[in-house]
């Protein structure tokens, strides 16, 4: 099972001091954002128990394996379901904590109920504040059952669930009608997928016999040990105040685990820590009781004394859960509760035993999960013990499970079960990723998803030129770092593959799929210089450049011209895709702008040194619009236009351009030049009679300027159809008759 614990601090005098902490003992837990471990998640689950919205809760991460939820402002914030999610991939596990209000109308006698498939579960809600009304039971938020208030037994409302099945699992609640849902008694029912003492897909496998209140997991047969106990069968007690699968975690605060509720992966659920009991886990065990929730009884024999955290403490000469075994009976010594090996390895397993008479090599045997018995190949006999060594045949996945070391002498026998985990070396599912490339190096990210088991201890990157038969080059890197492959050949394809390893002998996995990574071209080294440039218009610039003469072929694919407009902070780039080109026309520039200009040779994606920069000023754009344009009909075919010269001219006007268009017409407009720029009047002739026309005009210096306003005018009536408009200009002070 995943080593994941959700701790709830139940000192409830002040909700602001309440906190929930999720602790993971998994390797690489909670690192997030990398390929080796998703983060721990800790949140309130409002899907079933909804509480009034309040300020958001604060999540604080303490290192990679711990996350804490705080910021509860009022007691109602605490009521409901909280969950912590940890572990990676198929081992991703959710641990659930259900919090009841101490002031509720109904309180659960026991919050977590773990039962076997087919059992009868009984949920008991104790009356705390009586109401003479029905009690509604809900399952996962939906109506389930009604009890009349007369049906209370000894101040309790009982919900009996016969023949429970796994789908019956979930959150149950008991609530008085017309009472706030926050006053409900909330329960968690966990139904194991198998009957008592069984596990596995068809429930065909036998559980190891979990001790001290441990619960056999119905999927993998492992014991989920209560807080404060460890070992394959939960046979060992942790030191006071410690928890976690290896007793590696310590309860916070000076009073140890007092006032803390511990929630572990299903099918365990939640309980107080070892040595504590009560709804708020603040009461020490009564004499003769020990363990989580003080559920266990010592019943020590032969002078043993009861410790509320660990159970019987035996006097010398005795051992066993109740001090019932004499030290003369043979005893397996210091057997690890869990061993890990890699697939297809042939490990050596040691098993040590003591006793009177003294165990010899033939009296110690090793039994595999399939029942195969291995005899030791050699034994080391020391004054206080005999250590038998077993050479294990090549391991297969089916060897995962509970192995047993057994010693038999005339004084009796002892056996110790231990878990063997056969791990599959990791194999990359994808090729490594190219991050950046240069002409002689590649930067590669080796982090890829993989099949098999972690944690990843080393990453090997194998590479060689594509289509080469030479040996692979290998570089060993830290799993979390990117790799730089150096001293490569330019413009060359390399085949690159990842190989992952996990700890232990035979932990190297097969090579992952190859990928082709190509180094960049050589950098161009020649520096061009600008020969010259000239302006071909207000927005056009002709540029020419040269390159130094060097022997050999030119290393380059083309040129990059860069124009920098410092005023606007804008850069214009122009690509000239021929390495033979030595001139370019730049168009669409901004008139009246001061540019800094340079040119660079490029090769593939690499740029060579830039030429010394040149500074170019483009002439400004055309003049402003003519002012006060006016149209006046003179006859059935003539209209006179008058205007005033534009203001603030940047230079002398070379001409005016008039645009003539029939109002509402669909045809193209006609443009007429007025070539005497000093004039402020012109007559447009050859127009159609009784026709409405639109006019506008603009001036030209080096370029055309802005259009004036548009004016409308109609010719006088009933003339003949004209051939088309023409123009005659006069200075405004001249007479108009000819």
């Amino acid at each position: 099972a995943v080593d994941l614990t959700l701790l709830a601090n139940l000192r409830l005098t002040d909700p602001q001091r309440f906190f929930l902490t999720c602790v993971s003992g998994e390797a690489g837990a909670g690192r997030g954002s990398d390929a080796w471990g998703p983060p721990l998640l800790l949140e309130k689950d409002d899907r079933i128990v909804r509480t009034p919205p309040g300020p958001p809760l604060r999540l604080a991460r303490n290192g990679s394996h711990q996350v804490t939820l705080r910021g509860f402002s009022k007691p109602s914030d605490l009521v409901g379901v909280f969950s912590c999610v940890g572990g990676a991939g198929a081992r991703r596990t959710r641990v659930i904590y259900v919090h009841n209000s101490p002031g509720a109308h109904l309180l659960p006698d026991k919050v977590t109920h773990t039962v076997n498939k087919g059992d009868t579960a009984v949920l008991s809600a104790r009356v705390h504040k009586e109401k003479q009304t029905d009690v509604i039971w809900k399952s996962n938020g939906s109506y389930f059952y009604t009890l009349d208030w007369h049906e209370a037994q000894d101040g309790r409302f009982l919900l009996q669930l016969p023949n429970v099945q796994p789908p019956s699992s979930g959150i149950y609640s008991a609530t008085y009608l017309e009472a706030s849902p926050l006053g409900s008694a909330f329960f968690r029912l966990i139904v194991r997928g198998c009957g008592a003492g069984r596990w596995g897909p068809g429930c065909t496998k036998e559980c190891p016999g979990c001790l001290h209140g441990g619960v056999c997991h119905d999927h993998d047969g492992e014991c989920v040990c209560p807080p404060g106990f460890t070992g394959t069968r939960c046979e060992q007690a942790c030191r006071e105040g410690r928890f976690g699968q290896s007793c590696q975690e310590q309860c916070p605060g000076i009073s140890g685990c007092r006032g803390l509720t511990f929630c572990l992966p299903d099918p365990y659920g939640c309980s107080c820590g070892s040595g504590w009991r009560g709804s708020q886990c603040q009461e020490a065990c009564a004499p003769g009781h020990f363990g989580a929730d003080c559920r266990l009884q010592c019943q020590c024999q032969n002078g043993g004394t009861c410790d509320r955290f660990s159970g019987c403490v035996c006097p010398s000469g005795w051992h066993g859960v109740h001090c019932e075994k004499s030290d003369r009976i043979p005893q397996i010594l210091n057997m690890a509760s869990e061993l890990e090996f890699n697939l297809e390895t042939m490990p050596r397993i040691n098993c040590a035993a003591a006793g009177n008479p003294f165990p010899v090599r033939g009296s110690i045997e090793l039994r595999k999960p399939d029942g195969t018995v291995l005899l030791s190949t050699k034994a080391i006999v020391e004054p206080e013990k005999t250590t038998a060594e077993f050479e294990v045949p090549r391991l297969v996945l089916a060897d995962s499970g509970f192995w047993e070391c057994r010693v038999s002498t005339s004084g009796g026998q002892d056996s110790r079960r231990f878990k063997v985990n056969v791990k599959v070396p990791p194999v990359p599912l994808a090729a490594p990723r190219l991050l950046t490339k240069q002409s002689r190096q590649l930067v590669v990210s080796p982090l890829v998803s993989f099949s098999g088991d972690g944690p990843i201890s080393t990453v090997r990157l194998h590479y060689r030129p594509q289509d080469s038969t030479m040996d692979w080059s290998t570089i060993v890197v830290d799993p979390s770092e990117n790799v730089t492959l150096m001293n490569l050949r330019p413009k060359t394809g390399y085949s690159v593959r990842v190989q992952l390893s996990r700890p232990g002998e035979g932990g190297e996995g097969a090579w992952g799929p190859p990928t082709l990574m190509t180094t960049d071209c050589p950098e161009p080294l020649l520096q061009p210089w600008l020969e010259g440039w000239h302006v071909e218009g207000t927005d056009r610039l002709r540029v020419s450049w040269s390159l130094p003469l060097v022997p050999g072929p030119l290393v380059g694919d083309g040129f990059l011209l860069r124009l920098w407009d410092g005023t606007r902070g804008q850069e214009r780039r122009e690509n000239v895709s021929s390495p033979q080109a030595r001139t370019a026309l730049l168009t669409g520039l901004t008139p009246g702008t001061h540019y800094q200009l340079d040119v660079q040779l490029y090769h593939c994606t690499l740029l060579g040194p830039a030429s010394p920069p040149a500074h170019v000023l483009l002439p400004p754009s055309g003049p402003p619009a003519p002012r006060h344009l006016h149209a006046q009909a003179l006859s059935d075919s003539e209209i006179q236009l008058t205007w005033k010269h534009p203001e603030a001219l940047p230079g002398p006007i070379s001409k005016y351009v008039v645009e003539v268009q029939v109002a509402g017409g669909a045809g193209d407009p006609l443009w007429i030049d007025v070539d005497r720029p000093e004039e402020t009047s012109t007559i447009i002739r050859g127009l159609n009679a009784s026709t409405r026309y639109l006019f506008r005009m603009r001036a030209s210096i080096q370029g055309l300027g802005d259009w004036s306003n548009t004016v409308e005018e109609s010719t006088l009536g009933n003339g003949l159809q004209a051939e088309g408009p023409v123009q005659e200009s006069r200075a405004a002070e001249e007479g108009l008759d000819q």
Partner: antibody, heavy 126, light 108 residues
Framework: EVQLLESGGGLVQPGGSLRLSCAAS????????MHWVRQAPGKGFEWVSS????????YYADSVKGRFTISRDNSKNTLYLQMNSLRAEDTAVYYC???????????????????WGQGTTVTVSS | DIQMTQSPSSLSASVGDRVTITCRAS??????LNWYQHKPGKAPELLIS???SLQSGVPSRFSGSGSGTDFTLTISSLRPEDFATYYC??????????FGPGTKVDVK
């Protein structure tokens, strides 16, 4: 389909007895509080009796107390009303109904009759 | 016991009319009031729970309001299938349930 079907009605003389049945289908009968409601000709509805899911507690209207007995058989998904000492004023169409609870954010509300049967007619006449 | 009264006892209306029925409890029942529709020879149908909560599948032209002792059922635009008798029912007492005498809505 969720359904209630009453049966057992008929013509009976004053002082006589009759047993009504209500067969439930389409839902888990054993989890719900059940009721009998009647409607006399030309009159409104009158609640008659109710029984809790376990069958262990019952309630009656004053007008039928001591004469009528409500019961249920959860294994047969059936509700019963045993009517003794019948009177002319017991003449009515008798309906069985399922009680459900309306829930909103402020808490639970007591019964509404969300499923009704089509009714069975009881006539008490000499 | 809580007594329920309804008014009017009957009303005639046309399709498209807005119809309002009132129900009064002899003592405060909070919002613990349900409305039912009944057509002859059919099972009664629950329309509204808890004074104002429309039952799933009931058309939105039906609405309920009120709290304490005075309650209202409104049909915003009467349809042909709405001609029936309407009953209010208190659910404040958990052991006994009383109905109003009913309001018959028929064609004008």
């Amino acid at each position: 389909e969720v359904q209630l079907l009453e049966s057992g009605g008929g013509l009976v003389q004053p002082g006589g007895s009759l047993r009504l049945s209500c067969a439930a289908s389409g839902f888990t009968f054993s989890r719900y509080k059940m009721h009998w409601v009647r409607q006399a000709p030309g009159k409104g509805f009158e609640w008659v009796s109710s029984i809790v899911p376990s069958g262990g507690w019952t309630y009656y209207a004053d007008s039928v107390k001591g004469r009528f007995t409500i019961s249920r058989d959860n294994s047969k998904n059936t509700l019963y009303l045993q009517m003794n000492s019948l009177r002319a004023e017991d003449t009515a169409v008798y309906y069985c109904a399922r009680q459900m609870y309306y829930y909103d954010s402020s808490g639970y509300y007591v019964g509404r009759f969300d499923i009704w049967g089509q009714g069975t007619t009881v006539t008490v006449s000499s | 016991d809580i007594q329920m009264t309804q008014s009017p006892s009957s009303l005639s209306a046309s399709v498209g009319d807005r119809v309002t029925i009132t129900c009064r409890a002899s003592q405060s029942i909070n919002t613990y009031l349900n409305w039912y529709q009944h057509k002859p020879g059919k099972a009664p149908e629950l329309l509204i729970s808890a004074a104002s909560s429309l039952q799933s599948g009931v058309p939105s032209r039906f609405s309920g309001s009120g709290s304490g002792t005075d309650f209202t059922l409104t049909i915003s635009s009467l349809r042909p299938e709405d001609f029936a008798t309407y009953y209010c029912q208190q659910s404040h007492s958990i052991s006994t349930f009383t109905f109003g005498p009913g309001t018959k809505v028929d064609v004008k």
